[in-house]
């Protein structure tokens, strides 16, 4: 039988290459059985993950999975960094892997690189 533990489906060492000024939705896919857990986002500062308070978040429901979404409206250069979602379930905390946002500041980029270029060379995105 299938596990009824909460599971957070963010891949280890995943990343997103995005542009400052664009809107972006960071999704935390959540699998649960009966009761939807409370989920939060935090941003890594060294080894500490600082909870993101007062940010626009929402839920999206699909057939086998729910998504807890952190909205960037728009993306700022300071949004560069690593994020983690956590679920509070039966008084236990389940943490996802972290996922990294590489933010390109279009003001400092001579021309907007293609997604393929960014995807294959993420080191271009460190500003």
């Amino acid at each position: 039988k299938e596990s009824c533990d909460v599971q957070l489906y963010i891949k280890r060492q995943s990343y997103h290459s995005i542009f400052a000024g664009d809107p972006f939705k960071l999704e935390c896919p959540v699998k649960y059985c009966a009761h939807r857990p409370q989920v939060t986002w935090c941003k890594l500062n060294g080894t500490t993950c600082v909870k993101l308070e007062g940010r626009h978040t929402s839920w999206k429901q699909e057939k086998n999975l729910s998504f807890f979404i952190l909205h960037f409206e728009p993306v700022l250069p300071s949004d560069n960094g690593s994020y983690r979602c956590s679920a509070n379930f039966l008084s236990a905390i389940i943490e996802s892997h972290s996922t990294t946002l590489y933010v390109t500041d279009v003001k400092s980029a001579s021309e907007r690189p293609s997604k393929d270029e960014m995807a294959s060379r993420p080191w271009l995105l460190y500003s």
């Epitope: 489906y9 963010i10 891949k11 280890r12 997103h16 290459s17 890594l44 995807a119 294959s120 993420p122």
Partner: antibody, heavy 119, light 112 residues
Framework: QVQLQESGPGLVKPSGTLSLTCAAS????????MYWVRQPPGKGLEWIGR????????RYNPSFKSRATISADKSKNQASLKLSSVTAADTAVYYC????????????WGQGTLVTVSS | DVVMTQSPLSLPVTLGQPASISCRSS???????????LNWLQQRPGQSPRRLIY???KRDSGVPDRFSGSGSGTDFTLKISRVEAEDLGVYYC?????????FGQGTKLEIK
Amino acid sequence: QVQLQESGPGLVKPSGTLSLTCAASGVNIKDTYMYWVRQPPGKGLEWIGRIDPANGYTRYNPSFKSRATISADKSKNQASLKLSSVTAADTAVYYCAVYDGYYESFDVWGQGTLVTVSS
Amino acid sequence: DVVMTQSPLSLPVTLGQPASISCRSSQSLLDSDGKTYLNWLQQRPGQSPRRLIYLVSKRDSGVPDRFSGSGSGTDFTLKISRVEAEDLGVYYCWQGTLFPRTFGQGTKLEIK
């Protein structure tokens, strides 16, 4: 169970481009990372790079100096490797492999395909 | 790049006897999530590699319990409690913590 099948030409001319495809079954590749490793005859293993098929984002071994391109086609449940400007030193068995991107719960390698670079 | 150094490179064994392979990394493989992404692969003659051990000590499904992995940080060991004929081949450690992923040179397990 998860299985991989590599395909592509076994012989490539020097300065040409090596092209291989890796078809997965038993898993939806969007939930995985797929990667390529090569093994020159009688030698050890060398990691070429990997792709997240969910979004197409890649990581490469810098020693391939931008010669390698890994792509994925979610609709066909397969990944591809292209290696340009090949020389005899690129003669090797090329393996594709796939692993669970979330919990490392599986890691499966293909049977490998020998690619010889020769005129 | 992280350099993975295995020893010995050749390991003659008597069937039924134990065997041990060492793997050292040039940097710690402890990731920021508190886990250590060190894997062991087995490559039998003429076959593709298969993962035996992941996260230092977790056995893959179908791997006999005579195989065990241990270690932390930069120092790791694969042990076979009693070597069987089907265990002969080359064993590789490799790290999945840092990019690019890197492999040890391989240890050839052969009959004495």
